[in-house]
């Protein structure tokens, strides 16, 4: 048994950290293998982490953590048995992809604009609650063409679209990333999309 | 009520071996790492030996590494603490401290919050 | 290892006025954010030492609220509001960040 690429991990600099790795052959991770990981720090213990298979080679684990502070660092071993296939350490500060932000609400009720509105995924006392940005992707199914980025780069989880911008009458999704520029994080997964329909019609004068 | 209860402390001639016990009780000895502390006459405290709760870790001052060796059985409540190759030094009260609970991904510390009441060990010809 | 050097080692104190016991170690004993790992302990004469406070200003359960730890990084302070005749005895710093666990030397605080 070999392991073909080794584990990389990212933390949701909250309680979960996400190993991901691939075998050299199809493996049953959770049956066959064991990613064993330690805080060093004292009178620390091994924890260990039963795999999920991501793929017929891959496997991730889903560390269980505390909260992230920077001088954390923490020792992986991968085993197959008795047998260690690879051994590394990881730093979960160093290594930061947000949690994806929920909640993302589209609200047409507002004069001339479209409202869209989400939940920041951390809580207010977490180090990341102050520090995303967003990103909100915009498209249609109806206009395969039509595919927006907006950068939300102040911290109200929330954006505003002139409703005249979109095209009336037909249907739009929009979902929702998050990264933290301070802590150097890869972009969040994207929140699931919500999806409306434009129904803004120009007043007469201005047709 | 939380305590611990030293034992097996005495009379030893130099090159000679004791083994000290603490009993634990009134908590889950398991889930907290364990500490010995001593004092010799007259003098201040020095940090000797630690476990964690699961006795996988162990750590050692540099005055008694390859000497003494700390273990514990869970099944007990017991920390023990084997003294070998004594010397004149090592005379000193030993006391056991309750440490940090360690069963936790990153120890939850309180400080040494209870300590026993102390066993005296002589190493004397 | 780490060093824990405290001041002074003797300490004459008029019950009821304040006192103010100084701690410093050779390197940053700060893991993350209000968590410096240096704890106060009191061995008064013939006893076991009780723990006063963890990590750096936490007062330990059943401790009176005269006492109270402050500092972070490499200085410490261990302060008694109003000093009374039971505080006598010998209190100690101690780094407990990793190990070797190091204590201070040791203040006698004894009354006037």
């Known amino acids: 048994m070999k392991v073909l690429q080794e584990p990389a991990c990212v933390s949701d600099y909250m309680s979960i950290s996400t190993c991901e790795w691939k075998m050299g052959g199809p493996t049953n991770c959770s049956a066959e293998l064991r990613l064993l990981y330690q805080l060093v720090f004292q009178s620390s213990e091994t924890h260990t982490c039963v795999p999920e298979n991501n793929g017929g080679v891959g496997c991730v684990c889903h560390l269980l953590m505390d909260d992230v502070v920077s001088m954390d660092n923490y020792t992986l071993d991968l085993w197959a048995g008795q047998q260690l296939l690879w051994k590394g350490s990881f730093k979960p500060s160093e290594h930061v992809k947000p949690r994806a932000p929920g909640n993302l609400t589209v609200h047409t009720n507002v004069s001339d604009t479209v409202l869209l509105t989400w939940s920041n995924p951390y809580p207010p006392d977490n180090y990341l609650y102050n520090d995303l940005t967003y990103a909100v992707n915009i498209w249609s199914e109806n206009d395969p063409a039509y595919s927006r980025i907006h950068n939300v780069t102040y911290l109200k989880p929330t954006l505003r679209i002139p409703a005249s911008t979109l095209k009336s009458g037909i249907s739009y999704r929009a979902r929702v990333r998050a990264w933290a520029q301070h802590y150097n994080t890869t972009w969040s997964e994207w929140s699931p999309s919500t999806k409306w329909y434009n129904s803004y019609r120009e007043p007469f004068e201005q047709r | 009520e939380v305590q611990l209860v030293e034992s097996g402390g005495g009379l030893e001639q130099p090159g000679g071996s004791l083994r000290l016990s603490c009993a634990g009780s009134g908590f889950t000895f398991r889930d907290f790492a364990m500490t010995w502390v001593r004092q010799a006459p007259g003098k201040g405290l020095e940090w000797v030996s630690s476990?964690?709760?699961?006795?996988?870790?162990?750590y050692y001052a540099d005055s008694v590494k390859g000497r003494f060796t700390i273990s514990r059985d869970n099944s007990k409540n017991t920390l023990y603490l084997q003294m070998n190759s004594l010397r004149a030094e090592d005379t000193a009260v030993y006391y056991c401290?309750?440490?940090?609970?360690?069963?936790?991904?990153?120890?939850?510390?309180?400080?040494?919050?209870?300590w026993g009441q102390g066993t005296t060990v002589t190493v004397s010809s | 290892d780490i060093v824990m050097t405290q001041s002074p080692l003797s300490l004459p104190v008029t019950p009821g006025e304040p006192a103010s016991i100084s701690c410093r170690s050779s390197q940053s004993l700060l893991y993350s954010i209000g968590y410096n790992y240096v704890d106060w302990y009191l061995q008064k004469s013939g006893q076991s030492p009780q723990l006063l406070i963890y990590?750096?200003?936490k007062r330990a359960s059943g401790v009176p609220d005269r006492f109270s730890g402050s500092g972070s990084g490499t200085d410490f302070t261990l302060k008694i509001s109003r000093v009374e005749a039971e505080d006598v005895g010998f209190y100690y710093c101690?780094?407990?960040?990793?190990?070797?666990?190091?204590f201070g030397q040791g203040t006698k605080l004894e009354i006037k």
């Open positions: 401290a309750k440490d940090r609970l360690s069963k936790t991904i990153r120890p939850r510390y309180y400080g040494l919050d209870v």
């Open positions: 990590l750096g200003n």
């Open positions: 101690m780094q407990a960040l990793g190990s070797p666990y190091t």
């Open positions: 476990i964690s709760g699961d006795g996988s870790n162990t």
